[in-house]
């Protein structure tokens, strides 16, 4: 056996990540992404 998938980074998902995907689609730039993830970190 290999289990090769565990070494792979996927750009899409087998599950419904609708909420996150819809947020991602509204972020227009790399800077927006950074701000959003900083916000997520701060809210933990």
């Amino acid at each position: 056996g290999g289990g090769g998938s565990k070494h792979k980074c996927f750009r899409n998902s087998l599950e419904n990540n609708e909420t996150l995907e819809s947020i991602m689609n509204t972020l227009e730039s790399e800077e927006d992404f950074r701000k959003y993830f900083y916000y997520l970190e701060g809210s933990k």
Epitope: G1, G2, G3, G4, S5, K6, K8, C9, F10, R11, N12, S13, L14, E15, N16, N17, E18, E21
Partner: antibody, heavy 128, light 107 residues
Framework: EVQLVQSGGGLVQPGRSLRLSCAAS????????MHWVRQAPGKGLEWVSG????????GYADSVKGRFTSSRDNAKNSLYLQMNSLRAEDTALYYC?????????????????????WGQGTTVTVSS | DIQMTQSPSFLSASVGDRVTITCWAS??????LAWYQQKPGKAPKLLIY???TLQSGVPSRFSGSGSGTEFTLTISSLQPEDFATYYC?????????FGQGTKVEIK
């Protein structure tokens, strides 16, 4: 030879359960995600479920969510679809399929959902 | 969900004809599109993925093009074994969705 051999279909009454099986050979089964796709009589193709190599990620179509459960046994090179609370609209030919796990050299990421090997199909008829 | 629409739904053609099938996505899917061929009583067969990459073993008379929302499958010279139903499918995002199919029949 890369092959997927299906079993477990049949006639079942509404509300009852059925389990489909898919036996894989000719490739490293636990390297790949797998899928179930169905085709109602005279209709097109509909994705039902997908499961990652280690069952860590499992997705379902809204039409079957909460009723169907996809699982796999990598030691047995087998994929399963447990179908509960069956409805007349679940009547279809069910296919298992292997995911290619396509690598896009431009982005450096893999993508799910390209199905490059298919089983022969098994018929599920839900009727009283 | 992303809706996939194919045109035409039915197509009558003769051996040797050049055949083009179009597929539209309800939103941009980059080049994340696959084409499948299905013959009566048989499982679908992958023909093309990533909009234009020919699957191993598929004859070169098949080709695909397009990106974004509009895609085409072309058969440069239709052969007797090509009479079948063809489906496009987006693999951009969950859930994967198929077009309704295009049945290529003998004229």
């Amino acid at each position: 030879e890369v092959q997927l051999v299906q079993s477990g279909g049949g006639l079942v009454q509404p509300g009852r359960s059925l389990r489909l099986s898919c036996a894989a050979s000719g490739f490293t089964f636990d390297d790949y995600a797998m899928h179930w796709v169905r085709q109602a009589p005279g209709k097109g193709l509909e994705w039902v479920s997908g499961i990652s190599w280690n069952s860590g990620s499992i997705g379902y179509a809204d039409s079957v969510k909460g009723r169907f459960t996809s699982s796999r046994d990598n030691a047995k090179n087998s994929l399963y679809l447990q179908m509960n609370s069956l409805r007349a609209e679940d009547t279809a030919l069910y296919y298992c399929a292997k995911d290619m796990e396509y690598y896009d050299i431009l982005t450096g990421y893999y993508s799910y959902y390209i199905m490059d090997v298919w089983g022969q199909g098994t018929t599920v008829t839900v009727s009283s | 969900d992303i809706q996939m629409t194919q045109s035409p739904s039915f197509l009558s053609a003769s051996v040797g004809d050049r055949v083009t099938i179009t597929c539209w996505a309800s939103q941009g899917i980059s080049s994340y599109l696959a084409w499948y061929q299905q013959k009566p009583g048989k499982a679908p067969k992958l023909l093309i993925y990533a909009a234009s990459t020919l699957q191993s073993g598929v004859p070169s008379r098949f080709s695909g093009s397009g990106s974004g929302t509009e895609f085409t499958l072309t058969i440069s010279s239709l052969q007797p074994e090509d009479f079948a139903t063809y489906y496009c499918q987006q693999f951009n995002s969950y859930p994967p969705t198929f077009g309704q199919g295009t049945k290529v029949e003998i004229k």
